[in-house]
């Protein structure tokens, strides 16, 4: 708390500018009008205030807006956002994606903070769902965001949002998460033609059931071995040699190099030797 003292003569701030960096904490408290600060928040970030001075400015805003800052102020907080507590942020009603982006930019290059987590939570809850534009924004700043959501949270992601997901956004997902995401992706991309569909669905196939893999094998998709190795073992086991051959196309030769690894190893053990021999790869069941 800064003690209430009268502003010295001639020091009353007419605008937020560089001259304020020479003000002591008590002078900032006494001479800067909170309403002026609120309307000129965009200037604060251009001025090299100390952390202690920023504390005073935050205190003034807190007094002006005890129920929480309006979005017009929030959007221009800049580095002052780093001074906010999760409790402060829970009072906010952030609805604009531009505001979200502006605040995520402040934390860019750093790991998730409690403040940012609270902000995202408030924003997504306010929107009612994790829509495509929001997901697009969040994964741009936090590529691991999608895979940090629980299967329960992912189940509320609308299929339309799946269009925002890039292959790298799924890199850290586990099998349980892909089980939830795959049916959504299948729904989202259902109206695409064969080759385009496969390009989009490929990253999600770690959650695909056997019947979908069988269907893909009829479409000349030429799945690469890296994708095949990420498929669910229980989904691969019932596939016939002919189906795997069709699924992989020219990449079928890669099975030899992966014969000791899952799911290839387990699949080989389920096949008749006569069938494996038709591949001409020397695979031993």
């Amino acid at each position: 708390e800064v003690e209430k003292t009268a502003c010295p003569s001639g020091k009353k701030a007419r605008e937020i500018d560089e001259s304020l960096i020479f003000y002591k904490k008590w002078e900032l408290e006494a001479c800067v009008d909170a309403a002026l600060l609120a309307t000129q928040m965009d200037r604060v970030n251009a001025i090299p205030f100390t952390y202690e001075q920023l504390d005073v400015l935050k205190h003034k805003l807190d007094e002006l807006y005890p129920q929480g800052y309006p979005e017009s102020v929030i959007q221009h907080l800049g580095y002052l956002f780093l001074k906010m507590s999760p409790e402060d942020i829970r009072k906010w009603n952030v609805t604009s994606l531009e505001t979200l982006k502006a605040l995520l930019e402040v934390n860019k290059g750093h790991e998730m903070s409690p403040q940012v987590a609270t902000l995202i939570d408030r924003f997504v809850k306010g929107r009612g769902q994790l829509d495509k534009d929001t997901l697009d924004t969040l994964t741009a700043f936090y590529p691991g965001y999608l895979c940090s959501l629980s299967p329960e949270e992912l189940s509320s992601v609308p299929p339309s949002s799946i269009w925002a997901v890039r292959p790298q956004d799924l890199d850290t997902c586990d099998p349980r998460q892909l089980d939830v995401l795959y049916p959504k992706a299948r729904l989202a991309f259902q109206n695409m033609n064969g080759s385009e569909y496969f390009v989009k669905i490929q990253s999600f196939l770690g959650g695909a059931p056997t019947e979908d893999l069988k269907a893909l094998s009829q479409q000349n998709v030429s799945m690469d071995l890296a994708t095949f190795m990420k498929l669910r073992t229980d989904a691969v086991l019932p596939l016939t040699v002919a189906e795997v051959q069709k699924l992989l196309g020219p990449h079928v030769e890669g099975l030899k190099a992966e014969e000791r690894h899952r799911p290839v190893r387990d699949w080989i053990l389920r096949q008749r030797q006569d069938d494996l021999d038709t591949l001409g790869l020397g695979l031993q069941g």
């Epitope: 790991e111 998730m112 903070s113 691991g144 895979c147 940090s148 959501l149 629980s150 329960e152 850290t172």
Partner: nanobody, 116 residues
Framework: QVHLVESGGGSVQAGGSLRLSCVAS????????MRWYRQAPGKEREFVSA???????SYADSVKGRFTISQDNARKTVYLQMASLKPEDTAMYYC??????????WGQGTQVTVSS
């Protein structure tokens, strides 16, 4: 940089229990996702369990109902309580931490051996 250290492994008879711990240090960020994987001799590393940013959990079918993942309040330690252990649970158990930025970190592992 993040450092993970697992402990709690050991030898146990079938039907017995063990509790694995994984302690994280360094900048893990807020609410990282913590997962346990395991690797049996001559096999690939496989997913065992996860605890996500909202504190909900998931399990591989093979351990569901027998294993329980949990985290302490400081969020820097994750546990794997393993009960009704079977010989097929024998493996090296690894802890993995994933941050919201997508950085992944693995521990060195702790050995679990279950004899019949």
């Amino acid at each position: 940089q993040v450092h993970l250290v697992e402990s709690g492994g050991g030898s146990v008879q079938a039907g017995g229990s063990l509790r694995l711990s994984c302690v994280a240090s360094g900048d893990t960020g807020y609410q990282p996702t913590m997962r346990w994987y395991r690797q049996a001799p001559g096999k690939e590393r496989e997913f065992v369990s996860a605890i996500y940013s909202d504190q909900t959990t998931s399990y591989a079918d093979s351990v569901k109902g027998r294993f329980t993942i949990s985290q302490d309040n400081a969020r820097k330690t994750v546990y794997l309580q393993m009960a009704s252990l079977k010989p097929e649970d024998t493996a090296m158990y690894y802890c993995k931490l994933t941050t919201r930025r997508g950085s992944e970190y693995w521990g060195q592992g702790t050995q679990v051996t279950v004899s019949s």
